[in-house]
């Protein structure tokens, strides 16, 4: 027999199947051109000294063989003597170590058995009514296919599934979607309605994330506010990585979980933009404002649960940096300017009240004045900080106010609003004898003392009503008592107390008259 022909004689080895576990398997045969055919198979076991024979039986009952030698692939033409338009039965016999091993048979019509490809190129994955939908372009000239899929998770073996018959230029498959674990999918195809046609190879892995992206388990820390009025947000703990099935480890497009950082600046609500979303890897600098920070995890199916933190405002105050002058036309604040063309946000809120009650004002971009100061003025009619109470003031600055992460804190301080000099007047001044020539003067704390850093000192004035001599005694802002000594018995005195701020002299309290009684000796 010629090697190119199927030999219609008995093969050159005894006809006996050893029934061993090794041997030929997975025989596939198909047409590869208008007149050429190919069969290929796998051989399990030691390959040394193995000879393979492709056997073929025609519908007439006549059988022939091709000698393939040690190869596990064989090509032949339509001139080889094999009927290609009618059904034939093919199998492989492998002769090794004086025994014959047989593959399972395949029965097919060779002419219409086309080598089907698995889905090639881009397999689009989407979610449809709680299931996974895969879609791909049908390989060229291969419309009409049966499609199967197999899938596994990191902890489960392959499971087989059926996509059903396909008959279009695009093919698709509905597959199960796992809620919380990643899956690896592979697809294969075979010719539709062709008896005994072989399955294609499995496609490349399609890696699919869980329906719910994992909740980010991260922790943040915030550094101290620096000289530039900014503090760094740092990630203390990276998000945990998703466990992947074997074929998705390494490069696994499709299973990526992206973590985004959403910043919401709570302070200074009058600015243009309050929120900004960043990649988690790019940790921002923040001003000393209060922020809410959310980490949002998302995959190709959309966002998952987020984790939210509150970053409180930095309450470190600069008691001297802010100058406030109160005039008849209104009030003006002065502070050291940051740079040219800066926008400032001045925020104030009554102390001890909810942060939601903060009020703010945004300045137009301004350059420093000749003294290097920035200013903000308001009239009495505006009502800003008009009530006689303590306000917490924070000033933020930015050269790019539309960019949330470029704000910095200029200063934080306290200010007593309204008519501070009158409102701060100490009340309940009382005088008690202390000794033969001294008295103790007490008073209730000034309202200014509720405003940290605002009350510079108390001044106690004592006036001798006889000689009209006046003495003034400065008292620490934390004290509400002073001892006046060197007084004369029987002389009438008046005492008054006032509370001063750094920029404002207080109003004296109502005069309090007293005298030290003359002691009569027995």
């Amino acid at each position: 027999c010629r090697t190119s022909e199927c030999c219609f004689q008995d093969p050159p080895y005894p006809d006996a199947d050893s029934g061993s576990a090794s041997g030929p398997r997975d025989l596939r045969c198909y047409r590869i051109s208008s007149d050429r055919y190919e069969c290929s198979w796998q051989y399990e076991g030691p390959t040394a000294g193995v000879s393979h024979f492709l056997r073929c039986c025609l519908s007439s009952g006549r059988c022939c063989y091709f000698a393939a030698g040690s190869a596990t692939r064989l090509q032949f033409s339509d001139q080889a003597g094999v009927s290609v338009l009618y059904t034939v039965t093919l199998w492989v016999e492998s002769w090794a170590r004086n025994q014959t091993e047989k593959s399972p048979e395949v029965t097919l019509q060779l002419y219409n058995s086309v080598k089907y490809e698995p889905p090639l190129g881009d397999i689009k994955v989407s979610k449809l009514a709680g299931q996974l939908r895969m879609e791909w372009e049908t390989p060229d000239n291969q419309v009409g296919a049966e499609v199967q899929f197999r899938h596994r998770t990191p902890s489960s073996p392959w499971k087989l599934g059926d996509c059903g018959p396909q008959d279009d230029d695009t093919e698709s498959c509905l597959c199960p979607l796992e809620m919380n674990v990643a899956q690896e999918f592979q697809l294969r195809r075979r010719q539709l309605g062709s008896q005994g046609s072989s399955w294609s190879k499995w496609s490349s892995p399609v890696c699919v994330p869980p329906e719910n992206p994992p909740q980010p388990q991260v922790r943040f820390s915030v550094e101290q506010l620096g000289q530039d009025g900014r503090r760094r947000l740092t990630l203390k703990e990276q998000p945990t990585q998703l466990e992947l099935p074997e074929g998705c480890q390494g490069l696994a497009p499709g299973t990526e979980v992206t973590y985004r950082l959403q910043l919401h600046m709570l302070s200074c609500p009058c600015k243009a933009k309050a929120t900004r979303t960043l990649h988690l890897g790019k940790m921002p600098y923040l001003s000393g404002a209060a922020y809410n920070v959310a980490v949002i995890s998302s995959n190709q199916f959309g966002p998952g649960l987020n984790q939210t933190w509150h970053i409180p405002a930095d309450t470190h105050t600069e008691p001297v940096a802010l100058n406030i002058s109160v005039g008849t036309n209104g009030t003006t604040m002065y502070w050291p300017a940051r740079a040219q063309s800066m926008t400032y946000c001045i925020e104030w809120q009554p102390v001890g009240q909810d942060g939601g009650l903060a009020t703010c004002s945004l300045t137009a971009p301004q350059d420093p004045d000749p003294a290097g100061m920035a200013t903000y003025s308001w009239s009495r009619e505006s009502g800003a900080m008009g009530q006689e109470k303590c306000y917490y003031i924070t000033i933020f600055a930015s050269a790019h106010p539309e960019k949330l992460t470029l704000w910095s804190t200029v200063l934080s301080t306290y200010h007593f609003g309204g008519n501070a000099s009158a409102a701060g007047t100490p009340h309940h001044v009382s005088v008690k004898n202390h000794s033969l020539d001294s008295v103790s003067v007490d008073w209730a704390p000034s309202l200014l003392s509720t405003c940290p850093g605002v009350l510079k000192e108390y001044v106690v004035r004592c006036r001798d009503e006889d000689s009209k001599q006046v003495s003034e005694h400065p008292v620490q802002p934390t004290e509400t008592q002073v001892t006046l000594s060197g007084l004369r018995a029987g002389v009438a005195y008046t005492v008054q107390v006032r509370a001063d701020t750094a920029w404002l002299r207080g109003v004296w309290s109502q005069p309090q008259r007293f005298s030290i009684e003359v002691q009569v000796s027995d």
Epitope: S34, S83, V84, L85, Y86
Partner: nanobody, 124 residues
Framework: QVQLVESGGGLAQAGGSLRLSCAAS????????MAWFRQAPGKEREFVAH????????NYADSVKGRFTISRDNAKNTVYLQMTRLKPEDTAVYYC?????????????????WGPGTQVTVSS
């Protein structure tokens, strides 16, 4: 004597249709597999379509699948090839062939009986 005669060839426009007939005489062809082949100038004879004796099974070359249809009328001892959506590359001499051995091949030398052929020309 045994004879196969093709007819129905001619000139057609691209996109047009032709119907070829193959009449058999001299023996009963109703027991034979029948096929159409074609040969363009300077090329080898190529398989076009095949029909088994009962008309239960048909096969087509990839280049004509969906455009050509083979059929037979055993009472009239005739085989047909309906050609639609013709293309310039379909231009060739078309031959009718018979395989009494039912071998089921696309190789022209396996066929025992042949007609003289009919010319089909498709102009663009």
């Amino acid at each position: 004597q045994v004879q196969l005669v093709e007819s129905g060839g001619g000139l057609a426009q691209a996109g047009g249709s032709l119907r070829l007939s193959c009449a058999a005489s001299g023996r009963t062809f109703s027991n034979d597999d029948m096929a159409w082949f074609r040969q363009a100038p300077g090329k080898e004879r190529e398989f076009v379509a095949h029909i088994d004796r009962n008309a239960a099974s048909t096969n087509y070359a990839d280049s004509v699948k969906g455009r050509f249809t083979i059929s037979r009328d055993n009472a009239k001892n005739t085989v047909y090839l309906q050609m639609t959506r013709l293309k310039p590359e379909d231009t060739a001499v078309y031959y009718c062939a018979a395989d009494p051995d039912h071998f089921g091949t696309t190789w022209y030398q396996q066929y025992t009986y042949w007609g003289p052929g009919t010319q089909v020309t498709v102009s663009s």
